[in-house]
């Protein structure tokens, strides 16, 4: 079953390589268990950046070594991706799955283009 997912078209990462965006899904019914996955599409290749499953009303828990953190509020998930560099510029797609209770719903956003600009190295102060 399909579900609409909205996310911003463009986000500029901070000078510290942090990008945040909101992923919002139009839930057809109430879910108690939701999975959010961030996918990166670059050069027609799609790779999984991070994923978290959470109980509604609880915090998202990504793996300890994940570059993602997030919070949820209703049908919105606030995602933050850290440690980004210029080479990580690309389209970041939000995938939302309503896992429990059934039926299963799947929604995939159109993607957020994240631009990352590496900071200029500080000049030597002689």
């Amino acid at each position: 079953k399909a579900m609409h997912v909205a996310q911003p078209a463009v986000v500029l990462a901070s000078s510290r390589g942090i990008a945040s965006f909101v992923c919002e899904y139009a839930s057809p019914g109430k879910a108690t268990e939701v999975r959010v996955t961030v996918l990166r599409q670059a050069d027609s290749q799609v790779t999984e950046v991070c994923a978290a499953t959470y109980m509604m009303g609880n915090e998202l828990t990504f793996l300890d070594d994940s570059i993602c953190t997030g919070t949820s509020s209703g049908n919105q998930v606030n995602l933050t991706i850290q440690g980004l560099r210029a080479m990580d510029t690309g389209l970041y797609i939000c995938k939302v799955e309503l896992m429990y209770p059934p039926p299963y719903y799947l929604g995939i956003g159109n993607g957020t283009q994240i631009y990352v600009i590496d900071p200029e190295p500080c000049p030597d102060s002689d």
Epitope: G29, T32, Y100, P101, P102
Partner: antibody
């Protein structure tokens, strides 16, 4: 008619790995249902291992999550179960099954027996 | 995890008897008016077979002597008139919350 046939069972050494296959016929595994692996130790009840959704997402029982991988080959219409670091308590008949929209298991394979012993 | 408790664990009955098996959950497995509780029959050496889904709906091809009822935490599988082919083990299963869990089973034996 949906038919599921498991294979790959047999005797495995403790600490080893198993890779089971489940060949589906009469229905495409990408056609909107979810597919599961369930096991049953000799004389015991049923234990859900995990699922692969039609979207390709996988979902595992937390009690086995660190040791299990479920995958599929769409071109062969086949599901796979990989279980690592096997121990005696993994001895069981392993079934694959199809989940309906409300997560009842409406079609089952005949099962394949895995025995973990030295 | 939602641990389902079936009772009795086993029972002896005769052909023609009415048999009732119960399945109890520690919390409700209902959501928006639907019960995520299913029943299976398993015969020795065979895979389980879906009998009843969503607490009260008979699966395709299941005889009308099998019926399911209940909601919330308490569910019942009833065989109105036991037939020789009904001697088997019966399991309930919840799909309300992950991980999916099964009851420990009820073995129906010939008296």
């Amino acid at each position: 008619e949906v038919q599921l046939v498991e294979s790959g069972g047999g005797l495995v050494q403790p600490g080893g790995s198993l890779r089971l296959s489940c060949a589906a016929s009469g229905y495409s595994i990408t056609s909107g249902h979810h597919w599961s692996w369930i096991r049953q130790a000799p004389g015991k009840g049923l234990e859900w291992i995990g699922d692969i959704y039609h979207s390709g997402s996988t979902y595992y029982n937390p009690s086995l999550k660190s040791r299990v991988t479920i995958s599929r080959d769409n071109s062969k219409n086949t599901l796979y179960l990989q279980l690592n670091s096997l121990r005696a308590e993994d001895t069981a008949v392993y079934y694959c099954a199809r989940k309906d929209d409300y997560y009842a298991f409406d079609y089952w394979g005949q099962g394949t027996l895995v025995t973990v012993s030295s | 995890d939602i641990q389902l408790t079936q009772s009795p664990s086993s029972l002896s009955a005769s052909v023609g008897d009415r048999v009732t098996i119960t399945c109890r959950a520690p919390q409700s497995v209902d959501f928006h008016g639907k019960s995520f509780l299913h029943w299976y029959q398993q015969k020795p050496g065979k895979a389980p077979k879906l009998l009843i889904y969503d607490a009260s709906n008979r699966a395709t091809g299941i005889p009308s002597r099998f019926s399911g009822s209940g909601s919330g935490t308490d569910f019942t599988l009833t065989i109105s008139s036991l037939q020789p082919e009904d001697f088997a083990t019966y399991y309930c299963q919840q799909s309300y919350r992950s991980p999916i869990t099964f009851g420990q089973g009820t073995k129906v034996e010939i008296k």
